[in-house]
Interface confidence: low
């Protein structure tokens, strides 16, 4: 029986107790005088629970207070009694849901050393499921006296939650350890205990797939089951409006959070949680026709597509050759630059330069087709927009966390002592960015321009099939010797009146004279995923012309000619370490098979715990 | 065999990122250059690794990461006899050979010689006083002599610096993969990228079997002032959160 309201929590002992509890309680009632006065409580799974027991009602001086589950010797496993402060505290898990009866009794030490019962009181604590708090406390519950409640979100508004993933097993922790963990997190979360939630990871779901911002911790592996410690940041926030999370981001990454909490930190993420809707009575649904809006063609006119951040490590980045708005320049910071939002423009093979700082960016800019460069990770240089080969003047790791108006900083201050300054709340425009530091997907949304009632590729009413059109030229792809690259063909490259966007067309990659790219070529194309990928070696340095053919369902096609520029290694021989591994087998089998070579690079990256294969540059494959 | 050489683009060129390289090195290899199970598992079955070396270059050219020269314990009281250090450039097979086979053979030889000397001395003392029965008893009660060629050096004893993982034992699971985890980053996300961020857990069919590296990754012996050549390594206690 679940009470519909917390106020219904069981008070009428004799009528509502489980049968098994009757005798226990009647024994208690008969044995000692019962003092009524401790109100029944409610707790929520994953939330801290705390109640102060008014011991003066029960015990007089010299009495020994004993708190336990009614009829038992010990407390329920999720509760802890602090005899100093006379508080009962704990943090229930999912397995603790239900009603718990707590007995508080006072005993006095008799002359013969035995404990003589004085008074006793029994009260209940009902543990509600997790989502109860979202419905009750966050939205409507009245605060306890003296409690500051964070402003509730509107009924249909998502709650923005920051979650820290810990390598810890809550089931192995004592109730005190769980509460202590929340206490220790307060310095990072800056919210009170009752506003934090601590739950175990369920079904290995460490990461929230709806997260819009995330960062790593100091732990590289998860040994324990995992615990999720979260708190509310606000209502329906996005990456442009999240409050400053510097207090979480750097300590999580650098180990300070782990040191304070006493558990390794795996990572953190921010996501919007839809409020759990109140359960409704199901009613008959009448089927009604739904109008379908077809996707309109991408425009090549100047416009502002919706900003999206998509930091796929091995997908290209967009950086317009036009003026953009970006956050103000901050002090140089170690590591990878910030992911920024870009409108469709030049697509840069992004050097990823260290930890990406979360950033809020507002931008406006013209959508001008530009050049494509697949994403990769090369810290040793910064690539200006129009330059084909990396400049060799900057040997120091550029420490930029936001796009800079000028050349990257070559400040050689130690990476371990520099920290990013607090992020400014509002971004302001900066001059045209020459330093490419964004990682986003090659993608722009196409606004619907007309409504169609059919979405199939068959022309309507005998209209002739129209040939697909090239809308946004691929232009050029940049690749580096020994480094894997991949380019997702943007969905607005071609447009077909019947089949709509590029992803609905059949793409094929060809050389001159309609010759298909060979199975052994260093460039490969997956027509299903519309992904072009490859791994050039030193013999491929230079320019290579390729043709992307887009064919609609009616067999008509359009072509885009583009170049792949293969550059020498930007790091040259300056890389700070050379890794060498000896494997069993014949090198010729790997050297002559592009798929094996790519597999090797992917596996090497995996071995380093990295899914971004472009972090590895093959230098040599020889016979041992 | 195939020798593959590569560099890691996440490492800054300057100043020498020694801590990062050490971390990456010990993620894939034992101190003696033996591939860690996590590395082997990630590359198998297509690529079976036998040894790994990591050498500093560029701004780290003065450093040798794998195989390592373990620090030499120089206690304040009595310094141990110095063993000439090995050449860090030597291949890791030589390294394993130096660490396991040669010491075993040397120990066996010393035992053998000591045994022979002891027997000679004993026999000289009691020359002609042993009955056949006594002799038989002596042989029965004696310490067995292991000859050098009887030593099974085909497989060296497991290094105690590696955690002993039983075959049935399931390895712990890795964390969510944040892109480029070797260089931490904070990333705004989008639905399209979620594939890149999904945790590499058991349900992931492409997840390479994860073998956890030992919790501590530097050489385990003597850190007095400078390095020393001392084996065997002792394994450290596991990392236990407080």
């Amino acid at each position: 029986h679940w009470p519909s309201e917390p106020s219904e929590a069981v008070r009428d002992w004799e009528n509502q107790l489980e049968a098994s509890m009757h005798s226990v309680l009647s024994d208690l009632h008969e044995a000692v005088p019962t003092v009524v006065g401790i109100p029944d409580g409610t707790a929520v799974v994953g939330r801290s629970f705390r109640v102060t027991i008014p011991t003066d009602l029960i015990a007089s001086s010299g009495d020994i207070i004993k708190v336990s589950a009614a009829g038992k010797e010990a407390l329920p496993s999720w509760l802890h009694w602090d005899s100093q402060s006379h508080t009962l505290e704990g943090l229930p898990l999912d397995t603790d849901k239900g009603v718990h009866y707590i007995s508080v009794s006072a005993t006095r030490l008799g002359a013969n050393g035995s404990h003589i019962p004085q008074t006793s009181s029994v009260f209940s604590i009902e543990v509600y499921p997790e989502d109860h708090s979202e419905l009750q406390s966050v939205r409507t519950a009245s605060p306890d006296p003296g409690e500051v409640v964070s402003s509730a979100c509107a009924a249909d508004e998502p709650v923005t939650v920051l979650t820290v993933i810990l390598d810890a097993d809550l089931t192995k922790m004592t109730p005190k350890q769980r509460i202590d963990l929340l206490h220790r997190m307060r310095s990072f979360s800056e919210v009170e205990l009752h506003n934090m939630k601590l739950v175990p990871v369920v079904n290995n779901r460490l990461f929230d797939m709806s997260a819009f911002m995330a960062g790593p911790g100091n732990a590289k592996k998860v040994v324990e089951n995992g615990a999720l410690l979260s708190w509310k940041l606000g209502c329906s926030l996005n990456q442009n409006s999240v409050p400053d999370i510097h207090g979480v981001e750097a300590p999580a990454r650098e180990g300070a959070m782990s040191a304070q909490l006493g558990y390794p930190v795996v990572g953190w993420h921010i996501a919007n949680k839809k409020p759990p809707l109140p359960k409704r009575v199901r009613r008959q649904i009448h089927a009604t026709p739904t109008p379908v809006t077809a996707i309109g063609p991408p425009t090549t006119a100047i416009q502002e597509p919706p900003s999206r951040i998509v930091p796929t490590p091995t997908s290209p980045a967009i950086a317009p050759p036009t003026e953009t708005m970006a956050p103000p320049v901050r002090d140089p910071v170690p590591g990878k630059p910030t992911v920024t939002i870009r409108t469709r423009g030049a697509i840069i093979q992004t050097p990823t330069l260290g930890p990406i700082q979360p950033t809020r960016v507002s931008e406006a800019g013209t959508t001008v087709p530009g050049q494509i460069r697949p994403t990769m990770t090369i810290p040793g240089y910064v690539e200006p927009t129009a330059v084909a080969t990396p400049p060799t003047t900057t040997t120091k790791k550029p420490r930029v966390s936001t796009p800079k108006p000028a050349t990257p900083s070559t400040d050689s201050t130690t990476t371990t002592t520099r920290r990013p300054t607090k992020k400014p709340r509002t971004p302001r425009p900066v001059p045209r960015v020459t330093t490419k530091v964004s990682i986003t997907r090659l993608e722009t949304a196409s606004p619907p321009t007309r409504i169609r009632t059919t979405t199939s590729g068959v022309p309507r009413g005998g209209e002739p099939n129209q040939r697909p059109e090239l809308k946004n030229h691929i232009d050029r792809v940049d690749a580096w010797v020994g480094t894997y690259f991949e380019v997702k063909i943007p969905s607005d490259t071609f447009y077909d009146h019947e089949d709509t966007t590029t992803d609905k067309l059949k793409l094929t990659l060809k050389l001159r004279e309609q010759q298909l790219v060979g199975e052994k070529s260093w460039v490969q194309f997956n027509s299903n995923s519309q992904l072009m990928y490859g791994l050039p070696d030193s013999s491929h340095v230079g320019k290579h012309e390729y043709f992307m053919h887009a064919t609609d369902k009616g067999g008509l096609s359009a072509v885009d000619a583009f170049e792949i520029h293969v550059h020498r290694r930007p790091q040259g021989d300056r890389a700070p370490a050379r890794f060498k591994a000896k494997f069993v087998g014949d090198p010729a089998l790997v050297l002559n098979d592009i798929h094996k070579k790519i597999a090797l690079v992917k596996k090497l990256a995996f071995a380093f715990g990295d899914r971004n294969c472009s972090t590895i540059t093959l230098q040599n494959i020889t016979r041992g | 065999s195939i020798v593959v050489e590569w560099t890691n683009n996440t490492l800054p060129l300057e100043p020498c990122p020694k801590e990062q390289i050490a971390g990456l090195s010990r993620r894939i290899a034992e101190d003696d250059g033996k591939p860690r199970p996590a590395f082997s598992n990630a590359l198998e079955p297509d690529f079976k690794a036998t040894s790994i070396t990591v050498t500093g270059s560029g701004s780290c050219r003065h450093l040798q990461f794998i195989p390592v020269v373990p620090p030499r314990r120089v206690p304040s009281e009595a310094p141990p006899t110095e063993v000439p250090d090995r050449d860090p450039e030597k291949s890791s097979e030589d390294d394993v050979y130096l660490h396991t086979v040669i010491p075993a053979v040397v120990v066996a030889a010393i035992l053998l010689i000591a045994g022979i000397i002891a027997m000679i001395c004993y026999r000289k003392k009691r020359k002609g006083k042993l009955t056949l029965e006594d002799q038989a008893t002596f042989i029965k009660k004696g310490v067995p002599i292991i000859f050098a060629d009887e030593l099974d050096d085909s497989k060296p004893p497991p290094s105690s610096s590696m955690p002993l993982i039983l075959q049935e034992e399931k390895a712990p699971l890795p964390p969510p993969e944040y892109p480029n985890q070797s260089v931490p980053e904070t990333t705004p996300l989008n639905q399209d990228t979620m594939g890149e961020y999904t945790p590499l857990r058991d349900e992931d069919p492409n997840a390479p079997p994860y073998q956890p590296p030992p919790p501590f990754t530097a050489p385990m012996e003597g850190k007095g002032s400078r390095p020393k050549n001392m084996t065997p390594y002792r394994s450290p206690p596991p990392y236990v959160p407080p």
Epitope: - | H62, V74, P75, A218
Partner: antibody, heavy 123, light 111 residues
Amino acid sequence: QVTLKESGPGILKPSQTLSLTCSFSGFSLSTSGMGVGWIRQPSGKGLEWLAHIWWDDDKYYNPSLKSQLTISKDTSRNQVFLKITSVDTADTATYYCARRAYYYGSSYPMDYWGQGTSVTVSS
Amino acid sequence: DIVLTQSPTSLAVSLGQRATFSCKASQSVDYDGDSYMNWYQQKPGQPPKLLIYAASNLDSGIPARFSGSGSGTDFTLNIHPVEEEDAATYYCQQSNEDPLTFGAGTKLELK
């Protein structure tokens, strides 16, 4: 960001035991290769190394003071402690704790230092 | 114990000029091809700061005007060109043998 901070009694009498604490952040003594040591410097004089503890609880002491020194650590709390028994006025100095990490080919220097805590021994 | 002798005890150099500090060890501090010698800078009221490790390697964030050289028993620290902020005491320290020992220091003053 690596930081170390020493704390101590400030003033104590001869023959008492000096207890010093080094609280650090930005690294952990559960990470292999990490160590923390103590160095002291009497006012206007040079530096004297006292003791060192490594991540695996290996301890090293200056032989000239060994009988008086005890170094220990609390890995979970990121703290290292030094006890000096039966101090006298000659132990008046600024006491520093410093991190010492080792990488092969480096010389295991003390790469990060605390600001120091001043200790006066006087009757 | 290895005794480190620093000379001179103090040094006065004009801005922009070269400052050279010497450190001699009572026995070799080399081991396996590496020199276990470090140099630190200390300003009044501040802790020492690592400048050079393994005789010649500049620590992260240290300006390139600092350089170290030497092996065996003789080591040198050079600053060129000297800047105002370089006024401090410079210590050499060996880590080749326990106990770790420091030189007595050389004080750099600006003329």
